[in-house]
């Protein structure tokens, strides 16, 4: 799997999980989240050469098409596969609220 | 939806469905498929600017991060959303076989 265990241990130009820490205030301009101050969002990036973690039959075909027709521009793309939620604490007035924001953290990637 | 009805009617630099006809023999080197000779596989391509058909909370956050930090390289990517199967006819010896290949045709796209 193109996850932290593999991608953060290997220098990889191909599609892989990349570390990205987002500071809510500095990077997004959000002051309203009390905790956490930021989080490891991560992102997916890198080339999708032939059969590198191909996600669907179509991405396999597209990958093969690109290999045989290198001038083609129709190549698969490195995107998130598994995502996890993030729990945040914020306030409405003086009342603390805990919210789980879905699909905030990328855990693994794929070529699609 | 970033599908044929929208994308093939509008000139669009942003993420959209693009037409792609694949000839099995010429483009993939496959001689074993008897019918069809090729098919409209289509593919997804184009930029994913702020909130353009954002797929998940993560792609929204990433999009916002990119908008506020234009020097960042962590941008969402244009990939397939809805896929359809393709029915093919091939032969094993002289015996005709009909097979449905799943996820062969892209019908719409998203930024993920």
């Amino acid at each position: 799997a193109l996850d932290a265990a593999y991608c953060f241990r290997n220098v990889q130009d191909n599609c892989c999980l990349r570390p990205l820490y987002i500071d809510f205030k500095r990077d997004l301009g959000w002051k309203w989240i009390h905790e956490p101050k930021g989080y490891n969002a991560n992102f997916c990036a890198g080339a999708c050469p032939y059969l590198w973690s191909s996600d669907t039959q179509h991405s396999r075909v597209l990958s093969l098409y690109n290999t045989i027709n290198p001038e083609a521009s129709a190549s698969p793309c490195c995107v998130s596969q598994d995502l996890e939620p993030l729990t945040i604490l914020y306030y409405i007035g003086k009342t603390p609220k805990i919210e789980q924001l879905s699909n905030m953290i990328v855990k693994s990637c794929k070529c699609s | 939806a970033l599908d044929a009805a929208y994308c093939f009617r509008n000139v669009q630099d942003n993420c959209c469905l693009r037409p792609l006809y694949i000839d099995f023999k010429r483009d993939l080197g496959w001689k074993w498929i008897h019918e069809p000779k090729g098919y409209n596989a289509n593919f997804c391509a184009g930029a994913c600017p702020y909130l353009w058909s954002s797929d998940t909370q993560h792609s929204r956050v990433l999009s916002l991060y990119n908008t506020i930090n234009p020097e960042a390289s962590a941008s969402p990517c244009c990939v397939s959303q809805d896929l359809e199967p393709l029915t093919i006819l091939y032969y094993i010896g002289k015996t005709p076989k009909i097979e449905q290949l799943s996820n062969m045709i892209v019908k719409s796209c998203k930024c993920s």
Partner: nanobody
């Protein structure tokens, strides 16, 4: 439930100015962003400008001409549009994202024509 209502649209000549306003009602908290988007006929909705708590960002086509501003106390969002061009003609929508859920106003028409 959040409701948004835009106002201030109209017909102006090239080079003139308009100020759009958006009023949000309901329980406003956990705002990811507020922004202005526009949709020209036959086109998809595009970002014009967005505002988070202390950041703003603009589409390249409006930089230096449009200014977004937010009044959190009054739950309003404004868009000052100067040096308007015919290509700015569109329906302008106010958008608020609360904890990942998008809310949209009905839109206000801006027409720039001589």
């Amino acid at each position: 439930q959040v409701q948004l209502v835009e106002s201030g649209g109209g017909l102006v000549q090239p080079g003139e100015s308009l100020r759009l306003s958006c009023t949000a009602s309901g329980s406003i908290f956990g705002v990811f962003y507020m922004g202005w988007f526009r949709q020209a006929p036959g086109k998809q909705r595009d970002m014009v400008a967005i505002s988070t708590d202390d950041r703003t960002s603009y589409a390249d086509s409006v930089k230096g001409r449009f200014t977004i501003s937010r009044d959190n106390a009054k739950n309003t969002l404004a868009l000052q549009m100067n040096s308007l061009k015919p290509e700015d003609t569109a329906v302008y929508f106010c958008n608020l994202n609360q904890l990942g859920t998008d809310y949209w106003g009905p839109g206000t028409q801006v027409t720039v024509s001589s």
